[in-house]
């Protein structure tokens, strides 16, 4: 994206430049360099200092957002003298024109929706564009299908998530014929934005004394194994008084997901439904379809 880059430098400049596509800050190499460092300072005065690249005339910033504006700084010492240079990276354009209320979620294991709202001061002809880069910065994904509101892009639907990694950089650029539009950027973890489907293949089998519930873990976008899941079972006796508490049972994921509970014959009509979550986050899926067992005259 185009953004004003203003350099604050002494007479003999390092010619500091920043490529927002690769997040790479580079400068002119100096002979007999004894020390060099680069860092950025954001609007909240937080400092981020990445490792220098091997050639020591560039550095790459990984986990950073730029929409609030940042200042890059390079310090280089040579055997003769010291150099210092600042590079201001503002979010140019009219204040309040950037996309806002940006959020994304992954669903059905391989689909993603991102949505945003137009900036409050954005002109009528504003158009927004979404770009996604994975943490390895190897490829950029342009939004393939936009969701529109009166011709303005206010969301994006992706049905191919193969280019994503566990952490991804989202950039919403804006254009207008009238004024400059600010950009919005965000870093999102796929594990935090995935909404699981409920467990599948839920079955209940009962004998004279017990009932056994079995289910399969949901298919997910993240590569998760069985211990990464937590389940909740809602075993519910039908036709009970309103306000009667349901029995919620927590079950850790296993290779064979099952829950065996005492229930002797004759048993009243019950229903069971199950939901799933990532054990680390407990972002619960919706409930599975209720499965009924027992009889009305139990």
């Amino acid at each position: 994206e185009k953004s004003d880059l203003r350099t604050v430098a002494p007479a003999s400049s390092l010619n500091v430049r920043f490529d927002s596509r690769t997040m790479n800050l580079s400068w002119d190499c100096q002979e007999n360099t004894t020390f060099s460092k680069c860092f950025l300072t954001d609007k909240k005065n937080r400092v981020v200092e990445p490792r220098l690249s091997n050639n020591e005339c560039s550095c790459t910033f990984r986990e950073i957002c730029l929409h609030e504006g940042v200042t890059f700084e390079v310090h280089v010492n040579t055997s003769q003298r010291g150099f210092q240079q600042k590079l201001l990276y503002p979010n140019s354009g009219r204040e309040g024109t950037a996309a806002q209320n940006f959020s994304c979620f992954i669903y059905n294991a391989d689909l993603m929706n991102c949505t945003w709202a137009r900036g409050p001061t954005a002109p009528r002809d504003v158009q927004y564009f979404l770009y996604i880069r994975n943490s390895k910065r190897r490829r950029e994904i342009r939004c393939p299908y936009y969701i529109q509101d009166s011709g303005t892009h206010v969301g994006c639907h992706l049905d191919n998530l193969s280019g994503l990694t566990s952490r991804n950089y989202f950039l919403v650029n804006g254009t207008s014929r009238e004024i400059g539009i600010q950009f919005f950027d965000s870093l999102l973890d796929t594990k935090k934005i995935e909404r699981f489907n409920p467990p599948s293949n839920v079955t209940v089998r009962c004998n004279t004394t017990h009932c056994l519930v079995r289910w399969k873990q949901p298919r997910t976008y993240q590569k998760l194994s069985y211990l990464d899941f937590q389940y909740q079972l809602d075993v519910h006796r039908k036709n009970t008084q309103p306000g009667t508490e349901n029995l919620l049972i927590n079950v850790s994921g296993d290779l064979e997901n099952r829950y065996n509970f005492p229930s002797s014959e004759p048993r009243a009509k019950h229903s069971v439904k199950i939901r799933a979550a990532d054990v680390r986050i407990l972002n619960w899926s919706s409930w599975s379809e209720a499965i009924e067992f027992g009889s009305d005259d139990g």
Epitope: T165, K223, L224, L227, D228, L255
Partner: antibody, heavy 120, light 111 residues
């Protein structure tokens, strides 16, 4: 019940290669991820490699890079670990294990182990 | 030399409580990556006791518990029994070596 059954003990000469198999029963290999861990006699556990979901490929511990190859035959639900240019320090029990958790790196269950002896 | 440090041995009388420590660094346990614990009885394969720092897989008695704080983790065993005599290993992930790592192991003796 999911089980991992490994191939029998092997005796190899220095410089040779060994290929250990790990057969999955009670589940299909495509639904699982296998990692390999070894244990020298009287010593601790050492991770060798396995499927990494972040990279979406099999990754190897640095010290085995170039000497180890891990493969899978999904038609027979069998995983293989081949170690080449064997030396006496490679004498160990080699285990395959199912990754029970990616986020927490936890292995369950394990194969029974395959003893590989490297001796001239 | 293991990246995760465990005491070589601990001991306790039947019925007692013992803890086994596992000390790492900012590139593994403190990163923060989760810790798992294994029990290895003589001549058998390791068995998972604890995962995600403090969760027990099905079939593991609640006498075993795990905790984590900063760059260290620990395994506690209460109501010690003769059959608990085994080697115990902690495990985590290390971002500097980009690999799964194990502690050197702790031999538990039931007196």
């Amino acid at each position: 019940q999911v089980q991992l059954v490994q191939s029998g003990a092997e005796v190899k000469k220095p410089g040779a290669s060994v290929k250990v198999s790990c057969k999955v029963s009670g589940y299909t290999l495509t639904e699982l991820s296998i990692h390999w861990v070894r244990q020298a006699p009287g010593k601790g556990l050492e991770w060798m490699g396995g499927f990494d979901p972040e990279e979406n490929e099999i990754v190897y511990a640095q010290r085995f890079q170039g000497r180890v190859t891990m493969t899978e035959d999904t038609s027979t639900d069998t995983a293989y670990m081949e170690l080449s240019s064997l030396r006496s320090e490679d004498t160990a029990v080699y285990y395959c294990a199912i990754v029970g958790s990616f986020s927490g790196i936890a292995y369950r269950p394990w194969g029974q182990g395959t003893m590989v002896t490297v001796s001239s | 030399q293991s990246v995760l440090t465990q005491p070589p041995s601990v001991s306790g009388a039947p019925g007692q409580r013992v803890t086994i420590s596992c000390t790492g660094s900012g590139s593994n346990i403190g990163a923060p990556y989760d810790v798992s614990w294994y029990q290895q009885l003589p001549g058998t394969a390791p068995k998972l006791l604890i995962y995600h720092n403090n969760k027990r897989p099905s079939g593991v008695p609640d006498r075993f518990s795990g905790s984590k704080s900063g760059t260290s983790a620990s395994l506690a065993i209460t109501g010690l029994q003769a059959e608990d005599e085994a080697d115990y290993y902690c495990q985590s992930y290390d971002s500097s070596s980009i690999s799964t790592i194990f502690g050197g192991g702790t031999k538990l003796t039931v007196l």
